[in-house]
Amino acid sequence: TLNSVLINSNAIKNLPPPLGGAGGQPGSAVSVAPGVLYEGGNKYQTLDNYQPYPCAEDEECGSDEYCSSPSRGAAGVGGVQICLACRKRRKRCMRHAMCCPGNYCKNGICMPSDHSHFPRGEIEESIIENLGNDHNAAAGDGYPRRTTLTSKIYHTKGQEGSVCLRSSDCAAGLCCARHFWSKICKPVLKEGQVCTKHKRKGSHGLEIFQRCYCGEGLACRIQKDHHQASNSSRLHTCQRH
């Protein structure tokens, strides 16, 4: 499954297309792959119309989920399994994947893992959580891999495209923003460049591609000459106040 990067505590993952439905309709919760919320025409989808994601194995679900039938015991209707929320510490489990990151399944109970150097919820800005990547952690350990960024690369300010943790790691005129599988230094936006208009507080953590903010004296507004039927699919650009 697609790599998912934990950006901050506001990150909401696994907002998939409805069962049997095609993704991409405006106003629906859309995910191009388990674990990744995507930006459809600059319209950020929210939990308001959450739909379960069908799956065959745990790997198809996000870090905070596991694959199982929705009803206890027997498989769901027609044997359908969906991604279910992971189980917290001290909850019952049958395998590691059922437990939330930082925990593992021991004697049927989710227990804290010794491998988890960063307690969940702490210093989340300082880790990149790689899910479903091709370079697997030790087989069967049941934990998402967490990789910290090497401190030695921060002696000089990051140039465009270099990895970063926060904007202060980047050179002037750049900000630290998510770019598919990583966070890199990107240029602050200039007039006319595509920007992202966030519909609600905290939504910046949802994007698989983050853009920097518009530069001084500019605001992110709907492109005036962008004639499209639906407001939701219009591009926003940085425009003079």
């Epitope: 995507y38 790689n130 990895v163 770019h179 599988w181 990583s182 595509v194």
Partner: antibody, heavy 118, light 112 residues
């Protein structure tokens, strides 16, 4: 300035192996993800693999067409990117480019030709 | 197999404007407001011309511009010049196994 120089290409028989290298200079190599992209003769570009900035235990991704046969790696102390290619097939014949994956493929090498033929 | 669809060729006269289209699906190009364009002259390495839909890297002429609507992205070159004659490739990201996808390429011919 940023420079990427590939080497290691050549003629190899089907089923054989080859290891490509890419020497990087002019930028902080250890701060960038790096990729391999290939181009079959007269054809378009095809992404092959990408590796995280870290050289030990870093994340890697592969195109479905090479997964299980190719291995990407890097040595940050030598500013070098590698591509180990095993079980080569005729369809792997291409110019292999090493590319810096900053904001997309912002710098490319000149490429090295790999020919798989009996 | 090509994930993004581009016209095989386009042509224009010096001074004219041309547009190259790139069509994908909701799983790749349509799924993200994100696309890049590369220029490749014969026997040379590709060069990044546009990223993030319509952003130009430093050193790229402002005659090159990008846009995107739905599942289709476009590269427009205004004031065509002889040196613009090259192959152009779009690139996006995708869900599933292949994380990076390219278009099949478009050969731009500058007439005259």
């Amino acid at each position: 300035q940023v420079q990427l120089v590939e080497s290691g290409g050549g003629l190899v028989q089907p089923g054989g192996s080859l290891r490509l290298s890419c020497a990087a200079s002019g930028f902080t190599f250890s701060s960038y993800w790096m990729s391999w992209v290939r181009q079959a003769p007269g054809k378009g570009l095809e992404w092959v693999s990408v590796i995280e900035h870290k050289d030990k235990g870093g994340t890697t991704y592969y195109a479905a067409s090479v997964k299980g046969r190719f291995t990407i790696s890097r040595d940050n102390s030598k500013n070098t990117l590698y591509l180990q290619m095993n079980s080569l097939r005729a369809e792997d014949t291409a110019v292999y480019y090493c590319a810096r994956h900053g904001i997309d493929f912002d710098h490319w090498g000149q490429g090295t030709l790999v020919t798989v033929s009996s | 197999d090509i994930a993004l669809t581009q016209p095989a060729s386009v042509s224009g006269s010096p001074g004219q404007s041309i547009t190259i289209s790139c069509t994908g699906t909701s799983s790749d190009l349509g799924g993200y407001n994100y696309v890049s364009w590369y220029q490749q002259h014969p026997g040379k390495a590709p060069k990044l011309m546009i990223y993030d839909v319509n952003n130009r890297p430093s050193g790229v002429s402002n005659r090159f511009s990008g846009s995107k609507s739905g599942n289709t992205a476009s590269l427009t070159i205004s004031g065509l010049q002889a040196e613009d004659e090259a192959d152009y490739y779009c690139q996006s990201y995708a869900s599933g196994n292949t994380k990076v996808v390219f278009g099949g390429g478009t050969k731009l011919t500058v007439l005259g």
